[in-house]
């Protein structure tokens, strides 16, 4: 595929890659599929620089980030390391909290109002941001 | 790489007290809920009591319900059980078990409470 | 509390046999069980989770099935190394509890 040097349309560049903020609700593994439709993924935070950004931009609302431990451990969607990585939670957070009476706990991972993270229930119908990296390649084929 | 080590087992009398200790490595673990599990010498597993990442929630198995107190030290990496008035039922392998389907466990510890 | 019934609770089976174990939870768990092998003197190691994927590492013919109150794991050749006992726990709601366990035997 070609590279992609700058974002698509309604998209945020940032440091070298590109957001998109949603403005509607879906489950955590909808807005995975969303993003991943888009050659994205679920936005991945690396540093406070990029919460911040991402804190700007989405406001005091709940939005999905890409980080589950549906799987066990706690995972980035981009595959960065979770245990070394930039972490930003609540206080006593991640708590996997189980008295929602949904079924199961907590799996995946927002940003609350703060902007500091929670777990969740995956299924909640909340915000999301996808994210790309410029420079990698895309799917669409070459220009010939 | 994942590990958890449990510690603290032995002979204890009826009545007796003894305390576990689990030590974690190779993940956050703090950003885990944790738990004990036991498996009486030819039985089934039972779970025993789970602990939240920061401690603010705890649950416990009606049998060791007032007896047994979960706890944690996250800046140890350890998890611990405190167990107070022992009965002969208590007699068990005690394992400890990383999230609520235990997708990591421990080798475990035996405690063996005589009459 | 949400029972688990596990059936059988032991079976004789040859190296090659499809294998079948039953799960029956006492109320609707969606599909919040997971399938423990346990061989004899070591820890259980988790199987499968949310009642169908495959834990990293475990090979591909173990299979788990179900949601709501019935669930199945399948071993779909029988291996040497499987004979062991194995579990279902349902993590929906505390106290988290186990089935009773199935013991597979060599016939």
């Known amino acids: 595929g070609s590279e992609r040097t700058c974002c698509p349309v309604n998209w945020v560049e940032h440091e070298r890659s590109c957001y998109w903020f949603s403005r509607s609700g879906k489950a955590w593994a909808d807005a995975d599929n969303y993003c991943r439709l888009e050659d994205a993924h679920l936005v991945v935070v690396t540093s406070w620089e990029e919460q911040k950004f991402v804190q700007h931009h989405i406001g005091p609302v709940n939005t999905w980030m890409g980080l589950h431990d549906q799987n066990g451990p706690w995972k980035w969607v981009d595959g960065t390391d979770y245990e070394t990585g930039f972490k930003n939670w609540r206080p006593e957070q991640p708590d996997d909290w189980y008295g929602h009476g949904l079924g199961g706990g907590e799996d995946c991972a927002h940003f609350t109002d703060d902007g500091r993270w929670n777990d969740d229930v995956c299924q909640r119908p909340y915000r999301w941001v996808c994210e790309t990296e410029l420079d990698k390649a895309s799917q669409e084929p070459p220009l010939l | 790489e994942v590990q958890l080590v449990e510690s603290g087992g032995g002979l204890v009398k009826s009545g007796g007290s003894l305390r576990l200790s689990c030590a974690a490595s190779?993940?956050?673990?703090?950003?885990?809920?944790m738990n004990w599990v036991r498996q009486a010498p030819g039985k089934g597993l039972e779970w025993v009591s789970s602990?939240?990442?920061?401690?603010?929630?705890?649950d416990y198995a009606d049998s060791v319900k007032g007896r047994f107190t979960i706890s944690r030290d996250n800046a140890k990496n350890s998890l611990y059980l405190q167990m107070n008035s022992l009965r002969a039922e208590d007699t068990a392998v005690y394992y400890c078990?990383?999230?609520?389907?235990?997708?990591?466990w421990g080798q475990g510890t035996l405690v063996t409470v005589s009459s | 509390d949400i029972q688990m019934t596990q059936s059988p609770s032991s079976l004789s089976a040859s190296v090659g046999d499809r294998v079948t174990i039953t799960c029956r939870a006492s109320?609707?768990?969606?599909?919040?069980l997971v399938w423990f092998q346990q061989k004899l003197g070591k820890a259980p190691k988790s199987l499968i989770y949310?009642?169908?994927s495959l834990q990293s590492g475990v090979p591909s013919r173990f299979s788990g099935s179900g949601s709501g109150t019935d669930f199945t794991l399948t071993i779909s050749s029988l291996q040497p190394e499987d004979f062991a006992t194995y579990y279902c726990?349902?993590?929906?709601?505390?106290?988290?509890?186990f089935g009773g366990g199935t013991k597979v035997e060599i016939k």
């Open positions: 078990a990383r999230k609520s389907w235990f997708d990591y």
């Open positions: 190779g993940f956050t673990f703090s950003s885990y809920r």
């Open positions: 602990i939240s990442g920061s401690s603010s929630y705890i």
């Open positions: 109320q609707d768990i969606s599909n919040y």
């Open positions: 949310v009642a169908s």
């Open positions: 726990q349902q993590y929906n709601s505390y106290p988290l509890t």
